[in-house]
Interface confidence: medium
């Protein structure tokens, strides 16, 4: 379920843009990076696609947003929220957040200046 973010003006169009793109490759790419070749890998249904392929698809998706730079934080927050329940412990949560904040740079975008990834009612 999507969070009610309660913001006004431009950010609502960011929400629409984030909703229109497919964040799954980004989620899978980060999971691949933090899971390595562990057995749990299977449960993420991602072994069929190489991490570099997922990264390229992820960057393509982020690039689809009309205002990629301005809406980047929203996209990162949504990725965090989508994967929150699959992160098994605090260490994994922190790893995921670290990789997530590196994502814009991997895609040759500027990282958002301030982006609070503490989403999902404190679960993550």
């Amino acid at each position: 379920m999507r969070r009610e973010r309660g913001r006004q003006g431009d950010s609502s169009s960011c929400e629409r843009q984030v909703d229109r793109v497919n964040l799954k490759p980004c989620e899978q790419h980060i999971m691949q990076r933090i899971m390595g070749e562990q057995e749990q890998y299977d449960s993420y249904d991602i072994r069929s696609t190489r991490s570099s392929d997922q990264q390229q698809r992820c960057c393509d998706e982020l690039n689809e947003m009309e205002n990629t730079q301005r809406c980047m934080c929203e996209a990162l927050q949504q990725i965090m929220e989508n994967q929150c329940d699959r992160l098994q412990d605090r260490q994994m949560v922190q790893q995921f957040k670290r990789e997530l904040m590196n994502l814009p740079q991997q895609c040759n975008f500027r990282a958002p200046q301030r982006c609070d990834l503490d989403v999902s009612g404190g679960r993550c």
Partner: antibody, heavy 122, light 108 residues
Framework: EVQLVESGGGLVRPGGSLRLSCVAS????????MHWVRQAPGKGLLWVSS????????TYADSVKGRFTISRDNTNNTLFLQLDSLRAEDTAVYYC???????????????WGRGTLVTVSS | DIVMTQSPESLAVSLGERATINCKSS??????LGWYQQRPGQPPKLLIY???KRESGVPDRFSGSGSGTDFTLTIGRLQAEDVAVYYC??????????FGGGTKVEIK
């Protein structure tokens, strides 16, 4: 109103040619990838060709490669499909289709014209 | 090219009942799948994209699910206006995108 209107279909003999046109209105044509999809009578859908926003990267289904040419005129909001060396199996309704995507190609299609019928028969 | 296989080819369902259409891809396509409705004499209309996202204006009785190679379109309570042919489409490899063969939904 947001719409696509095709024209140029008709009856043509095998080996003949036709030029299909599609006029777009109600949206900013030059910001969208565009495609042609065809449907033979009573059959399913087959992607034929696509073209990026500035018209520089045409792609084609193997079955039409070398015979069909896609192009666009962004000034007049028009997409074209030149059909040459036509065969009986090219008989179909040809739909002009807008891609939802802006940057990458051939994703899903959120706006369809009503189609124009091409009949290839001797 | 990735082959999309739909089942069943046709389906007769009573008004108000649930209709379920399946689509299987010949290889993994993650969630790069759309569903279209084509009513008689009309062009196709986008219903679902990214396997499960409903297009704006599409009634919520239509829902999509699945990932990888197996996908489902469900019409929760069939209405008379839902009589149509439904197509799935993969866009994981593009071009070419490929469509399933279609499933005809009729009233029982």
């Amino acid at each position: 109103e947001v719409q696509l209107v095709e024209s140029g279909g008709g009856l043509v003999r095998p080996g003949g040619s036709l030029r299909l046109s599609c006029v777009a209105s109600g949206f900013t044509f030059n910001t969208y990838w565009m495609h042609w999809v065809r449907q033979a009578p009573g059959k399913g859908l087959l992607w034929v060709s696509s073209l990026n926003k500035d018209g520089s990267s045409p792609t084609y289904a193997d079955s039409v490669k070398g015979r069909f040419t896609i192009s666009r005129d962004n000034t007049n909001n028009t997409l074209f499909l030149q059909l040459d060396s036509l065969r009986a199996e090219d008989t179909a309704v040809y739909y002009c289709v807008r891609d939802r995507r802006a940057v990458t190609t051939a994703r899903y299609f959120d706006l369809w014209g009503r189609g124009t019928l091409v009949t290839v028969s001797s | 090219d990735i082959v999309m296989t739909q089942s069943p080819e046709s389906l007769a369902v009573s008004l108000g009942e649930r209709a379920t259409i399946n689509c299987k891809s010949s290889s993994n396509i993650d969630n790069y799948l759309g569903w279209y409705q084509q009513r008689p004499g009309q062009p196709p209309k986008l219903l679902i994209y990214w396997a499960s996202k409903r297009e704006s204006g599409v009634p919520d009785r239509f829902s999509g699910s699945g990932s990888g190679t197996d996908f489902t379109l469900t019409i929760g309570r069939l209405q008379a206006e839902d009589v149509a042919v439904y197509y799935c489409q993969q866009y994981y490899t593009s071009p070419p995108v490929t469509f399933g063969g279609g499933t005809k939904v009729e009233i029982k």
